[in-house]
């Protein structure tokens, strides 16, 4: 039902839910001190532009007693129970800042009447796509979804001279909540990734993995997983691989590969690490200090949440607008504003564009070495490495498919 | 208003080192990232560096691995230093903070320091 919205007479107030259960398992307190600090640049970037107003962060959490599994299994309801506490309370902002589940995003977008815009540090779902007033600040699926296709047919490189059309998904169910959400969208038989495969198979068990590598009757040569490098290597181990596999490890949210000690193990020779453009450092922030990659990235989701409300604000309020209407609520998406680590970019449908960066590891300095860059804005690849030192044959990715010749 | 003050520019050999400062009277650096640009003479304005408000760092191709960027946000000073200088590095350098605007240079500029590389 329509709540008030604290959202006037130069007071404007930002809900912030505050779930147990979360897209990555960060204490709530880190996301506190994310958001403080960006209402700390709000309101200087408000008063730089002569706009004498409050603006302020109600935290709001849920219990904890019946909804605390810490992951996004029972965030449904809990998003749901939240929205109500709101409700009751009579304390809605301008906009709320929170739910990162894609269960509860998409259940509290279809069951409230949304006259207030939803930022998200994750929804990484395809059931979150196209939503009006919801806005994504961590790489959701489609994009994923576009880069794997794009890749895919691309055959007109010095290193990728085939078209792909096939592909093994390995999905055990163990995933994190991004990776679950990312591998969901590549098994979905309606999704753009399948529709523009001919042959896409999923293996659930380790077993049929590790049968994959070896295998003359395989399918495909490409095989697409999500998580870490200890991830695969708990997987595979040092098992043979046949010498035409090519393993795609999407691993966004981790930016170690970038890192100057870091050596690649062996076993990732016959890898491609799928991750973003490296950057976000969040060198000198006092909510930064020992977070892990991921949580990191999590974590200034939810400081350029505030951001992103900031710069909405201070447009509305020099155009002299009203903030409570549907135009403020859909005006959160086409439009770059300046991120704490730089211009953040959101299309037409609120969520966020970034750089993908495809790594191989190099076979005489056993680095990371960047094959590619892929721009999410504009759906384009940009090779980066011409002649890259690869385990493959030739210096080249092999056809998908095995001893089938050039198409 | 907020006002940007460069200064450190001069005269220096070829191999030579030195360090622009850029100061403001108001917390621009605490709220927005900041460029530093330099304009050769007759030639186009161009960005040299980046500090982001996180403290992430870029630089142009030209100086990379030369020139460093850094901030103190308490005395509201953003540097830049320049390292191994040469003399395709003269030219007239330029601070600019503030919010990025239509044409993607931010709001708020100095008056510029010259710097000139020359034996």
């Known amino acids: 039902s329509q709540v008030s919205q604290n959202c006037h007479n130069g007071s404007y107030e930002i809900s912030v839910l505050m779930m147990g259960n979360s897209a990555f398992a960060e204490p709530l307190k880190n996301l506190e001190d994310a958001v403080n600090e960006g209402l700390e640049i709000v309101r200087g970037r408000l008063q730089n532009a002569g706009l004498n107003v409050t603006v302020n962060a109600t935290f709001m959490y849920s219990d904890g007693l019946i909804h605390n599994s810490g992951d996004c299994r029972s965030s449904t309801c809990e998003g749901l129970d939240l929205l109500r506490k709101i409700s009751n309370a009579q304390r809605m902002g301008c906009v709320l800042i929170g739910p990162s589940c894609t269960y509860s995003t998409f259940q509290m977008y279809l069951d409230t009447e949304l006259s207030y815009p939803m930022i998200s540090a994750g929804s990484f779902g395809l059931s979150c796509d196209y939503k009006e007033t919801l806005t994504r600040l961590m790489s959701p699926a489609r994009k994923l979804m576009y880069f794997l296709v794009n890749f895919w047919k691309t055959n007109d490189l010095p290193f990728k001279t085939y078209s792909w059309s096939t592909s093994y998904v390995y999905k055990n169910g163990t995933e994190t909540e991004d990776c679950f959400w990312y591998l969901n969208a590549l098994e979905a038989s309606v999704s753009y990734f399948s529709h523009e495969l001919g042959f896409k198979v999923v293996l659930r068990q380790d077993k049929e993995f590790q049968d994959i590598l070896m295998d003359h009757n395989r399918k495909s040569n490409v095989i697409i997983m999500c998580g870490g490098p200890e991830f695969l290597y708990k997987l595979k181990g040092d098992r043979a691989v046949a010498e035409d596999i090519v393993i795609i490890l999407v691993d966004l949210f981790n930016d170690q590969y970038f890192e100057d000690n870091v050596t690649a193990p062996d076993y990732m020779k016959n890898v491609l690490v799928l991750t973003l453009s490296p950057g976000n450092s969040l060198l000198n922030s006092s909510f930064s200090r020992n977070l892990s990659p991921t949580k990191r990235d999590f974590a200034l989701a939810y400081l350029n949440g505030i951001l992103l409300f900031g710069h909405m604000l201070k447009i509305f309020l020099e155009n002299g607008e009203n903030i409570t209407t549907p135009k403020f609520a859909h005006a959160f998406r086409n439009l770059t504003f300046e991120g704490y680590d730089g211009p953040v970019t959101l299309d037409d449908w609120g969520d966020v564009d970034s750089t993908m960066v495809l790594l191989y590891t190099s076979v005489d300095t056993k680095k990371y070495k960047v094959l590619l860059t892929y721009d999410t804005h504009v759906n384009k690849t940009y090779p980066v490495d011409m002649s890259p030192t690869f385990t493959w044959k030739n210096s080249k990715l092999p056809n998908d498919i095995t001893g089938r010749g050039p198409q | 208003e907020v006002q940007l003050v460069e200064s450190g520019g001069g005269l220096v050999q070829p191999g030579g080192s030195l360090r622009l400062s850029c100061t403001s009277s108001?917390?621009?650096?605490?709220?927005?990232?900041m460029d530093w640009y330099r304009q050769a003479p007759g030639k186009q304005r161009e960005i040299v560096a980046t500090?982001?408000?996180?403290?992430?760092?870029t630089y142009s191709d030209a100086v990379k691995g030369r020139f460093t960027i850094s901030r103190d946000n308490a005395k509201n000073t953003v540097y830049l230093q320049m390292n191994t200088l040469k003399p395709e590095d003269t030219a007239v350098y330029y601070c600019?903070?503030?919010?990025?605007?239509?044409?993607?240079?931010?709001?708020?500029w100095g008056q510029g320091t010259q710097v000139t590389v020359s034996s």
């Open positions: 108001s917390n621009i650096f605490k709220i927005y990232g």
């Open positions: 500090i982001y408000l996180s403290g992430r760092t």
């Open positions: 600019n903070a503030g919010e990025t605007t239509a044409s993607s240079v931010r709001q708020y």
